[in-house]
């Protein structure tokens, strides 16, 4: 139901892209967009499962929480949410499951209070490097974003551009160093094979990082050293075989960290010795008693915490003269 509102602010713009993006007339005070439900008391607008093909132009200026889930938006252009009067207090925006395949540079410009953004479950074949920074400057104005939810945004194989999906996402996260204040980043279920080594160092405010249900094989080149505020690191359901000494030491050095490592195919050979020793001593791994070996076959389902050095052997490498073809 729609209810009356008095706008707290007014907006004007000289930005050229706003000519088409901004509704010509300010919305009526009590207006609620067609196919949406509005509550001024809760400062919330819900346009959910309505097959909308574009963002409504007549969103009420009071909105703080906007749900645009389950639609068919396809593309978010520059200034997709720029309005007159502005959405000056829009703080939480959920666009999940709206069939977005392209998010353009400056899509979230003129949302100065946007703290939480959820783009999950959209096949983002084309995420502009400047989707979140809004500018191609080497150092852009800082983004107000605190939480960025990007779970399951990987497009089908045949729709991917001829480039690394990981690289495309990371470019958007790092552009202009705009996301220095980001505290929660969720990147679950994206088929990530690797994590580019520079991404975490440039997100120093992170408290929560979710990389679960990807295809990460190794963290060897990933540094957690700068993430002194990190409280939770979700690495469940990946393809991790072992964590090496450098990674173990960095994780142990984070003062508030909780690490989740369930459902990885741990290889319990001689390279696992350091990790087993660490697991027995550390308090940072949640549910560490559930971690089990996947390989080699003889070790399958053995609990890591119950292993000792005698269990962790490697088949000897024969010198060349003794090898057979």
């Amino acid at each position: 139901s729609s209810s009356p509102t008095s706008s707290a602010s007014s907006f004007s713009s000289s930005a050229p892209f706003l000519a088409s993006a901004v509704s010509a007339q300010p919305p009526l005070p009590d207006q609620c967009p067609a196919l949406c439900e509005c509550s001024e008391a809760a400062r919330t607008v819900k346009c959910v499962n309505r097959n909308l093909t574009e963002v409504p132009t007549d969103l009420p200026a009071y909105v703080r929480n906007l749900f645009l889930t389950g639609n068919q938006l396809a593309v978010l252009p520059a200034g997709a949410f720029a309005r007159r009067p502005p959405l000056a207090e829009l703080a939480a925006l959920n666009l999940s499951g709206s069939r977005l395949d392209e998010v353009r540079a400056g899509a979230f410009e003129h949302l100065p209070s946007l703290r939480q953004l959820d783009l999950s479950h959209n096949p983002l074949a084309d995420l502009s490097p400047f989707a979140f920074s809004g500018s191609n400057a080497s150092v852009s104005a800082p983004s107000p974003l605190v939480e960025l939810i990007l779970n399951h945004i990987v497009p089908p194989e045949d729709e991917r551009q001829n480039r690394s999906f990981e690289g495309m996402v990371v470019a958007a996260l790092l552009a202009g160093r705009a996301l220095q204040g980001l505290r929660r980043l969720e990147l679950a279920s994206n088929h990530f094979l690797y994590l580019p080594r520079d991404v975490l160092a440039q997100l120093p405010s992170l408290r929560h990082l979710d990389l679960s249900n990807n295809s990460l094989v190794s963290l060897t080149y990933v540094s957690f050293r700068n993430l002194t505020h990190l409280e939770s690191l979700h690495l469940e359901d990946n393809a991790l075989k072992v964590l090496h000494n450098g990674t173990l030491a960095e994780l142990q050095g984070l003062p508030h960290i909780r690490v989740f490592l369930d459902n990885n195919p741990w290889v319990c050979d001689c390279h696992m010795a350091d990790m087993v020793t660490w697991l027995k001593e550390t308090e940072v791994v949640q549910g560490k008693d559930r971690l089990t070996c996947a390989y080699p076959e003889k070790m399958r389902n053995r609990v890591l915490l119950e292993l000792n050095s005698a269990d962790l052997d490697c088949d000897p490498i024969l010198p060349p003269s003794l090898q057979t073809s």
Epitope: F11, S12, S13, L18, A88, E89, P112, P144, G181
Partner: antibody
Framework: EVQLLESGGGLVQPGGSLRLSCAAS????????MSWVRQAPGKGLEWVSS????????YYADSVKGRFTISRDNSKNTLYLQMNSLRAEDTAVYYC??????????????WGQGTLVTVSS | DIQMTQSPSSLSASVGDRVTITCRAS??????LNWYQQKPGKAPKLLIY???SLQSGVPSRFSGSGSGTDFTLTISSLQPEDFATYYC?????????FGQGTKLEIK
């Protein structure tokens, strides 16, 4: 050293107009969002208006919307507040203030010394 | 709009005292709160941002705490120059809203 210097205040009759200016120095003005905040005699602080660093977005309190216009000239390092249809309740010291670089949280890290606007017949 | 409510509205204390001023937001603002000090005839000065971070040049006797809706400004040992009015401000939204102020006076 960051400096903000307001000017343009004075005595004006109800219904009249004034234009306040704020000259900025000691920092990159074109990269900073700016704001006007006012304080009626013996009262607390009231936000009036804000403008993006680029000038592309302007925001107003309900109490001044449609009467006041904020603008900036980045080539002159100057912020403006055009005040029309002034009312007695607009009487206050008007401060210009700079938004800090840290938007987590938004804060006003430097303020001018203020200029007094008196609306009276 | 978010309402910011400070208490007390005025407070008398002596040099050397420990003083606490509280600020409550009408909705959660995480740790996105700032504190300002204003002396008579002067502009406000930013003291603390992000609830507990001291602005450069501010003496360490000032400290802030809190998260969500309830916040506190503490002056551990009052100095003569600390007698002033203190304002809290929410910085979660781009458009600032201030508390009504707490006037700290000499007893």
């Amino acid at each position: 050293e960051v400096q903000l210097l307001e000017s343009g205040g004075g005595l004006v009759q109800p219904g009249g107009s004034l234009r306040l200016s704020c000259a900025a120095s000691g920092f990159t003005f074109s990269g900073s969002s700016m704001s006007w905040v006012r304080q009626a005699p013996g009262k607390g602080l009231e936000w009036v208006s804000s403008i993006y660093y680029s000038g592309s977005g302007t925001y107003y309190a309900d109490s001044v919307k449609g009467r006041f216009t904020i603008s900036r000239d980045n080539s002159k390092n100057t912020l403006y507040l055009q005040m029309n249809s002034l009312r007695a309740e607009d009487t206050a010291v008007y401060y210009c203030a700079r938004y800090g670089r840290n938007v987590h949280p938004y804060n006003l890290d430097y303020w001018g010394q203020g200029t007094l606007v008196t609306v009276s017949s | 709009d978010i309402q910011m409510t400070q208490s007390p509205s005025s407070l008398s204390a002596s040099v050397g005292d420990r003083v606490t001023i509280t600020c409550r937001a009408s909705q959660s603002i995480s740790s996105y709160l700032n504190w300002y000090q204003q002396k008579p005839g002067k502009a406000p000065k930013l003291l603390i941002y992000a609830a507990s971070s001291l602005q450069s040049g501010v003496p360490s006797r000032f400290s802030g705490s809190g998260s969500g809706t309830d916040f506190t400004l503490t002056i551990s040992s009052l100095q003569p120059e600390d007698f002033a009015t203190y304002y809290c401000q929410q910085g979660y939204y781009y458009l600032p809203t201030f508390g009504q102020g707490t006037k700290l006076e000499i007893k």
